[in-house]
């Protein structure tokens, strides 16, 4: 019997530019003789419903149709037909199919590959054109993919140490697509410092598919107005 097993759940997620290994394991009732077997990997884009051959291995020869694509003949002997793709790009997301032939048998497996890019986040203080006692804090998230992102603001006071979500005076701009296919977005928080307690900690919280835990950037309101430290102004908090 010949069977192929792919990533459990049918989806693999990989970071942009990573050297990704798309898993494909072969289960065969006899020891594998790689000279009598064939492996073909196919890719089908998310946007275009046509399959393209990525890599082919047949006993006496192997050919990469995507630069750098490789299946290790050494690992193949033990049933590992996983495909390695160096420097994975956003446009390479889609369905990958591992086809295994041990003549006269043939088996297939498919997996969805999602390519994600994590946002970089930074806090900026914009004082231009602001009224007395008014500050505008900007939380810039850049270089993320896919487009869906959630940016919220929270505050913690000495009285209420648990974070409270801020819903008023928050404006999140439209997402902007970069040349490389990633996205940027800026969320703004308007504060009236005269009405806020010194020592209050504000956080910009970024949630994205590429992040295991939310990305948090914070600043503390001090008694003196506009006293955001230089690091708080420009640091990349990713």
């Amino acid at each position: 019997d010949l069977k192929v097993e792919m990533m459990a759940g049918g989806t693999q997620i990989t970071p942009l530019n990573d050297n990704v290994t798309i898993f494909c394991n072969i289960f065969y009732s006899q020891p594998l003789n790689i000279t009598s077997m064939g492996i073909t990997w196919f890719w089908k884009s998310l946007t275009f419903d046509k399959e393209v051959k990525v890599f082919e291995f047949f006993g006496d020869h192997q050919e990469a149709f995507r630069p750098g694509a490789i299946v290790s003949p050494w690992r193949l002997k033990s049933g590992d037909a996983s495909l390695r793709l160096p420097g994975i790009q956003l446009e390479e997301a889609g369905e990958y199919r591992c086809e295994v032939v041990v003549t006269p048998l043939k088996a297939q497996g498919t997996v969805q590959l999602e390519v994600v890019a994590s946002p970089a986040s930074r806090l900026l203080l914009d004082q231009v054109g602001m009224k007395e006692n008014e500050d505008k804090y900007m939380c810039e998230s850049s270089g993320f993919y896919p487009e869906a992102i959630n940016i919220t603001w929270e505050k913690q006071t000495q009285k209420f140490p648990h974070p409270i979500e801020i819903s008023e005076d928050v404006i999140t701009g439209p997402t902007i697509k970069n040349m490389d296919g990633t996205f940027n977005v800026t969320s703004c928080l308007k504060l009236n410092s005269s009405q806020e307690d010194p020592g209050t900690v504000y956080q910009c919280v970024v949630r994205h598919a590429s992040l295991h835990t939310p990305l948090r950037s914070n600043f503390t309101l001090t008694a003196a107005r506009h006293s955001l430290s230089e690091t708080e102004k420009t640091d990349n908090f990713s």
Epitope: T35, S36, F42, E51, T103, P104, L105, K106
Partner: antibody
């Protein structure tokens, strides 16, 4: 000219075994995989299994695993299928056929078929 | 196992008709579909492979199309010698399975 010549019709009793032969000519025997297909009551086709003469790799449909055994004799370019513990359900026409592509299993040449009748 | 459901079971035709036979796979088989013709008392004959590739010597009135689970086989202008049973087969994964057949009969 490619030819697949099968052995003649068989009339057997339930419980018996039979070995059907398929003698090939006109091509390099080891370059093609040999398959066997069952056709019952003139309509449906069922893949029984196949054998790669180069490596003696065999593969069977789960349904025929305990029913059929495929072998080859490279010296005479002949493929064989043995069917055991015959019942009336095994009465059918059996074809040998070949596939040549490395990753595709379409059957380009077929034998003339061997009619097997199992009856008490 | 992948089930190939072919329809119709039989199709009454006249010479010159355009005929379409469909085959539906129980799961995606990419484009790994084959079509055969079988005349009474004869062995099956290969007509098309990889969905749309005509085998050597097969007239261009025979065409195939489809992808994934839905496939069609068309005879643009039926001729008398086309009266036969037509079978689809998937060679996407073993065990390789066939459709139940479609019989082309005189109307």
């Amino acid at each position: 000219e490619v030819q697949l010549q099968q052995s003649g019709p068989e009339l057997l009793k339930p419980g018996a075994s039979v070995k059907i032969s398929c003698k090939t000519s006109g091509y390099t025997f080891t370059d093609y995989t040999m398959h066997w297909v069952k056709q019952s009551h003139g309509k449906s086709l069922e893949w029984i299994g196949g054998i790669n003469p180069n490596y003696d790799n065999t593969g069977y449909s789960e349904k025929f695993k305990d029913k059929a055994t495929l072998t080859v004799d490279k010296s005479s370019s002949t493929a064989y299928m043995e069917l055991r513990s015959l019942t009336s359900e095994d009465s059918a026409v059996y074809y040998c056929t070949r596939s040549g592509s490395r990753r595709s299993f379409y059957f380009d040449y077929w034998g003339q078929g061997t009619t097997l009748t199992v009856s008490s | 196992d992948i089930v190939m459901t072919q329809s119709p079971d039989s199709l009454p035709v006249s010479a010159g008709d355009r005929v379409t036979i469909t085959c539906k796979a129980s799961q995606s088989v990419s484009n790994d579909v084959v079509w055969y013709q079988q005349k009474p008392g004869q062995s099956p004959k290969l007509l098309m492979y990889s969905t749309s590739n005509r085998y050597i010597g097969v007239p261009d009135r025979f065409t195939g199309s489809g992808y994934g689970t839905d496939f069609t086989f068309t005879i643009s202008t039926v001729q008398a010698e086309d009266l036969a049973v037509y079978f689809c087969q998937q060679d996407y994964s073993s065990p390789y399975t066939f459709g139940g057949g479609t019989k082309l009969e005189i109307k």
